[in-house]
């Protein structure tokens, strides 16, 4: 399906299309692209309101958008294999036409990190709410659609077309009509701005009867930051209305002259400018010479001007502009510094916090301290960051190696610890008998007991000896039935699981009286170290930067 | 390429006017300000005004107001300037120049090879 | 209207050395928008003149990079790095800042 142009905003140096019509967003940029500009940016609050309102045009006129919400591409971006950057407001996505990273952002949600498709950016209307200038358009990220298959595709798009300059509007001074041609395309009659290079054709009378004249006026630019039409005088001047049609279209005083005829005036302290029609400021602060936040402040008799910048800014070769002073040069800060617009702001690599003496100082952070532990059970802290361990009978576990996991030492790397029956339990385990069989005093052997029906002899239940106190992982006890006594064939499971109040006869025994000699140490400790400090600057000189890092914040780490 | 083909030279007589030439080829004629540029023998360049074809749309400098007149056939892709009530002081090589970019007023990078005006009795 | 200044006469110079000739205005040339609109154009003996440099330090297309502009809002210099014959002729700076466009008087380059 093809777009319409369906409404057209011009303002500052820039003019805004959006149009209706199902396209995925690289035929979107690619119909932009044909007239000389891209999708549209949204780099301030100023420009969405921009976009808004071109939007709110487009929606007045457009009757096929029945969805309650719509949404519209603009020129928002990220390529595939590049993956999500949480830490800045673009989160990692670029504006097609190039530029900078801007500050603004209005997501609609918090975005899931995907490195493995293109993902594309569209504006999110809900038509069933009123287009408020408080109430800016909110960014909603996705596929970027497929050719060919509208089904995938979304309602419209923005494009952006951006210019040296802008004519005002023709000013009519009787009944007339204009009609602007743009470089892009766009007929209108009514813009606030006429871009740079754009037609207007002017036709004078009452509509109903033949048109007296026509004018045809080209916007170009006539010196430095001048464009103009280089008509002389309002149009479509009529003696029966004098100044009384839209003030003769002069842009401040209107004089009439006996004849009909009138002539265009300013107030004091402006001047006539060429088009003998729009007024000027007699004072050189009006034109806005200075720039980036700079204030224009009069000279002595309001003849020359300086520009003077705020504080954090200093104005830089051309006398005009204000540039950031970079604070961050004179290294005011322990670890991080992060320059910012007018300032500066001390930042602590992770594993550190803000404190101690001086101005920018950084802290240890201590992650093992009471009531902010991390680990399941133990916790060294050290210098930027910590690592846990566990006690006896356990491992560490989890993503990040803060949880602790009991060792089922029934099935341990060094085979089966009890002759018989074995049992795990948290943080330990107990050796049991088949019926007939009692545990001999070594609590893992099994001897032959004399014939009883009676409950099984064995040591009182120590089911809770050994167990460690802080472990997250469920208690449970499994009964793994092991090699019986020599010469006796292997005992096979029972259906029901052996619990510790069973007829079974079963022992337990701490774990260090029961490992025998010879056998694998049960006691391990991993500690996997915390390198929480990896992203600050503690990289090795020359060192392979490449491997990937499990962020906090979900994601793969990778830059 | 761009080029810009001027008139012959005019022999003329003092309180007569005179029509000069400047014809473009190699561009697109109506998008481009057309300057005029006045040089006496001997002496340095003077600025007398412009013309934008596609709409007309003129400039002087004050000094040759009411002396020279700028016009322009889209047609034929060719500018105009006219002389009026010409004296010995109208005796100069007039150029016409082009600006460099559509729409825009500056710089001069084409030139014409200049049209020698002699004012004599 | 700004009125351009320059000296009717460049220091003699010697063929493959450098050359400087200079250009005031009594307005600065400087924008807002932080160009320079400051023009330099030869004119060789019986030729039409020839762009050099726009907006004060820009290299026209086709100019050789012996030339070069530079300059404050109000004072400007065109260099040419080492001098060769066919650089004879007249200099003219010229300003497009305000209307009407005002040339100097042009500097006479004078070969040794």
């Known amino acids: 399906t093809g777009a319409d142009t369906e409404a057209v905003v011009c303002v500052g140096t820039a003019c805004y299309t959006a149009h209706s019509g199902k396209l995925s967003a690289a035929e979107a940029q690619n119909h932009c692209n044909q007239n000389g500009g891209n999708l549209a940016t949204v780099k301030s609050k100023e420009e969405a309101q921009h976009v808004q309102r071109v939007l709110a045009q487009l929606l007045r006129r457009e009757a096929a958008l029945t969805a309650r919400m719509s949404k519209f591409w603009i020129g928002l971006q990220r390529e595939k294999g590049k993956c999500l950057d949480p830490s800045l407001p673009l989160k990692g996505f670029s504006w097609v036409g190039g530029g900078e990273d801007t500050p603004y952002s209005n997501w609609h949600k918090e975005l899931r990190n995907s490195c493995i498709s293109k993902r594309c950016v569209s504006l999110l209307l809900d038509l069933s709410q009123p287009l408020l200038p408080s109430r800016l358009p909110k960014w909603s990220e996705g596929p970027c659609g497929s050719p060919g298959s509208p089904g995938s595709n979304i309602e419209g798009f923005v494009c952006k077309f951006s210019f040296k300059g802008m004519c005002r509007p023709l000013a009519l001074g009787g009944p007339g009509q204009v009609t602007y041609t743009t470089p892009f395309q766009t007929t209108s009659s009514s813009l606030e701005a006429v871009p740079f290079a754009s037609a207007a054709n002017v036709a004078c009378g009452e509509g109903d009867k033949d048109e007296t004249q026509s004018h045809y006026f080209l916007c170009k630019e006539k010196a430095p930051d001048v464009f103009d039409w280089g008509s002389s005088g309002p149009l479509c001047v009529s003696p029966k209305y004098g100044c009384n049609f839209n003030n003769g279209g002069c842009h401040q005083d209107c004089f009439e002259g006996g004849d009909g005829s009138f002539l265009c005036g300013c107030r004091p302290g402006f001047r006539l400018l060429d088009d003998l029609v729009t007024c000027a400021s007699r004072n050189p602060c009006s034109s806005s010479p200075c720039r980036g936040g700079a204030t224009c402040v009069l000279g002595p008799h309001g003849k020359n001007y300086t520009c003077r910048c705020p504080q954090g800014y200093q104005l830089d070769s051309s006398q005009l502009d204000c540039v950031d002073v970079d604070e961050c040069q004179d290294s005011p800060c322990a670890q991080e510094c992060v320059n910012t617009p007018g300032g500066f702001r001390c930042e602590c690599w992770v594993g550190y916090e803000p404190g101690g003496p001086g101005e920018g100082a950084c802290q240890d952070v201590d992650e093992c301290a009471l009531g902010r532990s991390p680990c399941a059970q133990g916790c060294t802290n050290t210098d930027g960051s910590f690592h846990c361990s566990c006690e006896e009978g356990y491992v560490l576990a989890g993503e990040d190696g803060t949880q602790c996991q009991d060792v089922d030492e029934c099935v341990g790397p060094g085979g089966p610890l009890c002759d018989s029956l074995c049992f795990n339990t948290q943080g330990s385990f107990h050796c049991g008998c088949l019926p007939g069989w009692v545990l001999a005093p070594n609590g893992v052997s099994c001897t032959m007991g004399p014939v009883s029906l009676g409950p099984p002899s064995g040591p009182p239940d120590e089911e809770d000896k050994g167990e460690k106190e802080g472990s997250t992982v469920p208690r449970a006890a499994t009964a793994s039935p092991t090699r019986g006594p020599e010469g006796t064939p292997k005992a096979t499971p029972t259906t029901s699981r052996p619990s510790l109040s069973s007829d079974a006869p079963i022992t337990s025994a701490p774990l260090k009286m029961l490992a025998p000699s010879g056998s694998p140490g049960v006691w391990r400790e991993p500690s996997i170290h915390h390198a929480t400090a990896a992203s600050g600057p503690q990289e090795p000189a020359g060192g392979d930067s490449s491997v990937a890092t499990q962020n906090n914040d979900g994601t793969d780490g990778q830059k | 390429q761009v080029q810009l083909q001027q008139s012959g030279p005019e022999l003329v007589k003092p309180g007569a006017s005179v029509k000069i030439s400047c014809k473009g080829s190699?561009?697109?004629?109506?998008?481009?300000?057309m300057n005029w540029v006045k040089q006496r023998p001997g002496k340095g360049l003077e600025w007398i005004g412009r013309i934008f074809p596609g709409d007309g749309d003129t400039d002087y400098d004050g000094k040759f107001k009411g002396k020279a007149t700028l016009t322009a056939d889209k047609s034929s892709n060719t500018a105009y300037m006219q002389l009026s009530s010409l004296t010995s002081e109208d005796s100069a090589v007039y150029f016409c120049?082009?600006?460099?970019?559509?729409?825009?007023?500056?710089?001069?990078?084409?030139w014409g090879q200049g049209t020698l005006v002699t004012v004599s009795a | 209207d700004i009125v351009m200044t320059q000296a009717a006469f460049s220091n003699p110079v010697t063929l493959g050395t450098s050359a400087s000739i200079s250009c005031s205005s009594t307005k600065s040339l400087l924008h807002s928008s932080g160009i320079t609109y400051l023009y330099w154009y030869l004119q060789r003996p019986g030729q039409s003149p020839q762009l050099l440099i726009y907006r004060m330090s820009n290299l026209a297309s086709g100019v050789p990079d012996r030339f070069s502009g530079s300059g404050s809002g109000t004072d400007f210099t065109l260099r040419i790095s080492r001098v060769e014959a066919e650089d004879v002729g007249v200099y003219y700076c010229?300003?497009?800042?305000?209307?009407?466009?005002?040339f100097g008087s042009g500097t006479k380059l004078e070969i040794k």
């Open positions: 010229a300003q497009m800042l305000e209307r009407p466009f005002t």
């Open positions: 120049a082009r600006t460099g970019a559509a729409y825009e007023f500056d710089p001069f990078p084409y």
């Open positions: 190699g561009y697109a004629f109506s998008t481009y300000w």
